[in-house]
């Protein structure tokens, strides 16, 4: 049975030419993390593996940075990174638990956190 | 020990398609991709495309989108490329390879497709 | 894409002697975050398939024999084999994979006189 839930950074904001960083945090579980997948849409940004440690995409290499912990950092931020990022957590013995985050790359200097939210 | 294992010459016709296998052994396949590329007499190394068993991520060579299909078979370890529309240009020999982020650091003997009529 | 221009083409050494083999790539394979050139060298030797020799343009791959060395980063690189041996005979290769489409060197024949 999976009793875990995703806590995401949420719905959030930054100005275009900034950096966000991603971050999810899976809890109420004693399931071993194998794997962290993030992903845009249906692309793949990195991986971080348990046992080889951080895979960034090629195509992302130049605006994406591993960490700071299973999180991700987007730099040079466009309008067009607008849109849904998913942390997808594969565990054992529980499977697969995925956290949504919504970013807005806003040109103005307005841009403002969203509150946390959770996802079971 | 880590293994990657092709499968054997291929004899094809212009127009046909084919595909190999690339079969692993001694570490987790999901863990790690697995490349293609491409080598003619002449033209040195070629990078076709990659996939992921862990995951439904692939990528391709824009030469090789349309030509290559990758696919993978998590339950026996196997990675497997489809080449389609065969014409001379795709005789070469083509090999599969292990990656993760630090390079490709494992290769398979590579199979040898002739494309003939 | 990236360009990878491998010189020379080809080289005739005797044994014992020390070989260059030089590589430019047309944009930096430096990935800031981690400050790894996304650069390997590849050793293949006739009727074989490729072997990685050094990986992160620097790091010799387990196995490899010290006189191979990979130096460089950003956009130049060099493998060097201290003293050459017979066995040595094969192409070398270089290969960026810092971006897609990985791309490779056109190569480096090396021949024992």
């Known amino acids: 049975m999976m009793t875990g839930t995703i806590e995401t950074t949420g719905n959030i904001s930054a100005e275009k030419g900034g950096s966000i960083i991603l971050q999810c945090h899976l809890s109420s579980t004693t399931a071993q993390v194998t794997q962290v997948n993030w992903e845009q849409q249906d692309q793949l940004l990195a991986i971080c593996n348990a046992d080889l440690g951080w895979h960034i995409s090629p195509s992302f290499k130049d605006r994406v940075a591993p960490g700071p912990g299973l999180g991700l950092t987007l730099q040079s931020l466009t309008v067009n990174d607008t849109g849904e990022y998913f942390c997808i957590y594969h565990t054992y013995p529980d499977g697969t638990y995925t956290g949504r985050i919504f970013l807005e790359v806003l040109e103005s200097s307005v841009a403002e956190h969203g509150a946390r939210f959770q996802i079971p | 020990q880590v293994q990657l294992q092709q499968s054997g010459t291929e004899l094809v016709r212009p127009g046909t398609s084919v595909k190999m296998s690339c079969r692993t052994a001694?570490?987790?396949?999901?863990?790690?991709?697995i490349h293609w590329v491409k080598q003619r007499p002449g033209h040195g190394l070629e990078w076709i495309g990659d996939i992921y068993p862990g995951g439904r991520y692939s990528n391709y060579n824009e030469k090789f989108r349309g030509k290559a299909t990758l696919t993978a078979d998590t339950s026996s370890s196997t990675a497997y490329m489809e080449l389609s529309s065969l014409t001379s240009e795709d005789s070469a020999i083509y090999y599969c390879?292990?990656?993760?982020?630090?390079?490709?650091?494992?290769w398979g003997q590579g199979t040898s497709v002739t494309v003939s009529s | 894409d990236i360009v990878m221009s491998q010189s020379p083409s080809s080289l005739a050494v005797s044994v014992g002697e020390k070989v260059t083999v030089n590589c430019k790539s047309s944009q930096n394979l430096l990935y800031n975050s981690n400050q790894k050139s996304y650069l390997a060298w590849f050793q293949q030797k006739p009727g074989q398939s490729p072997k990685l020799l050094i990986y992160?343009?620097?790091t010799r791959e387990s196995g490899v024999p010290d006189r191979f060395t990979g130096s460089g980063s950003g956009t130049d690189f060099t493998l060097t084999i201290s003293s050459v041996k017979a066995e040595d005979l094969a192409v070398y290769y270089c290969q960026q994979y810092y971006n897609y489409p990985f791309t490779f060197g056109s190569g480096t024949k090396l021949e024992i006189k």
């Open positions: 390879a292990r990656y993760y982020e630090s390079a490709m650091d494992f």
């Open positions: 001694g570490y987790t396949f999901t863990n790690y991709w």
């Open positions: 992160w343009a620097s």
